[in-house]
């Protein structure tokens, strides 16, 4: 399988609304113009697909309707926000970038963002 | 129901240019790739090359470089090839294709094919 | 450049009868992502090529389960069970492992 290398930021921490974005940018060998990017988190050795999205160069970054991602891509750039985060989807988020088309089929994996997410404290009640 | 249809057959003399297009219809232009494949008479198929109608980029076989040129008119869905340089042997059958990413890039719907015939 | 090979060049079919007919390529079509990229096609008389089959043994929408397609890495076949008169025409396969896209030369089919 000829690999690509992929690279991403290692810390980003999500809001207080629970959002967090990073940048995965992958170095094309060829004239990728078909792109499929895939967010997996790895958590106590486990590794689950979060969401995944084909596009084709110079279109939206199209993820499904219930999806938690959205993103844009620029170039070999894609920017990915990953919403609804609560404290117990800390973990390590990895991007898979796959080079659809033209052939030759190529796949690169990023190290990961280890995405750190701190659920807001209540407010407290006030008097005025 | 999708459809690419694709202009008229052309009689050039050798060294002219010909310029071929390919209407689509029924689905999202730019969600596909559109290849194009030249069919000499009684012979088989030949792959000339893609256009990404987002972003006109395209790759090509090397055999037809320099001399074809492939581009897009998203307001009109349309796509062209056009060849440049015209020998005999380029008289053919030229096909347009749409690539289905479902079906792992295979070629899934055609234009009816354009004759383009060279002589002098 | 990915050099396909089929055979035979012409296959004369008896209607209700099976057909095979064979495809080779230079390299392996098996990629190590589990990707066969092999595709079969009929272009009919006087018409436009059409797909039969993708990723090797997929059949593309609308083609009917007579038709199937097996093979390995480099050699291929495409059976057809039982043939019918509306089958005839020139079969070819092809790959879109490597660029430029190839196909072969072309099996045609006929009734006896």
């Known amino acids: 399988c000829k690999a690509m290398h992929v690279a991403q930021p290692a810390v980003v921490l999500a809001s207080s609304r629970g959002i967090a974005s990073f940048v995965c940018e992958y170095a094309s060998p060829g004239k990728a113009t078909e792109v499929r990017v895939t967010v997996l988190r790895q958590a106590d050795s486990q590794v689950t697909e979060v969401c995944a999205a084909t596009y084709m160069m110079g279109n939206e970054l199209t993820f499904l309707d219930d999806s938690i991602c959205t993103g844009t891509s620029s170039g070999n750039q894609v920017n990915l926000t990953i919403q609804g985060l609560r404290a117990m989807d800390t973990g390590l988020y990895i991007c898979k970038v796959e080079l659809m088309y033209p052939p030759p089929y190529y796949l690169g994996i990023g190290n990961g963002t280890q995405i750190y997410v701190i659920d807001p404290e209540p407010c407290p009640d006030s008097d005025f | 129901q999708v459809q690419l249809v694709q202009s008229g057959a052309e009689v050039k003399k050798p060294g002219a240019s010909v310029k071929v297009s390919c209407k689509a219809s029924?689905?999202?232009?730019?969600?596909?790739?559109i290849n194009w494949v030249k069919q000499a008479p009684g012979q088989g198929l030949e792959w000339i090359g893609d256009?990404?109608?987002?972003?006109?980029?395209?790759n090509s076989n090397q055999k037809f470089e320099g001399r074809v040129t492939l581009t897009v008119d998203t307001s009109i869905s349309t796509a062209y090839m056009e060849l440049s340089r015209l020998r005999s042997d380029d008289t053919a059958v030229y096909y347009c294709?749409?690539?289905?990413?479902?079906?792992?890039?295979?070629?899934?719907?055609w234009g009816q094919g354009t004759l383009v015939t060279v002589s002098s | 450049d990915i050099v396909m090979t089929q055979s035979p060049l012409s296959l004369p079919v008896t209607p209700g009868e099976p057909a095979s007919i064979s495809c080779r390529s230079s390299?392996?079509?098996?990629?190590?992502?589990?990707?066969?990229?092999l595709y079969w096609y009929l272009q009919k008389p006087g018409q436009s090529p059409q797909l039969l089959i993708y990723?090797?043994?997929n059949l593309a929408s609308g083609v009917p389960d007579r038709f199937s397609g097996s093979g390995s890495g480099t050699d291929f076949t495409l059976k057809i069970s039982r043939v019918e008169a509306e089958d005839v025409g020139v079969y070819y396969c092809?790959?879109?492992?490597?660029?430029?896209?190839?196909f072969g030369g072309g099996t045609k089919v006929e009734i006896k």
């Open positions: 294709a749409r690539l289905r990413r479902e079906y792992f890039y295979a070629m899934d719907y």
């Open positions: 092809a790959q879109n492992l490597e660029l430029p896209l190839t």
């Open positions: 256009i990404n109608p987002n972003n006109g980029g395209t």
């Open positions: 990723q090797m043994s």
């Open positions: 390299k392996s079509l098996l990629h190590s992502n589990g990707i066969t990229y």
């Open positions: 029924g689905y999202k232009f730019t969600d596909h790739f």
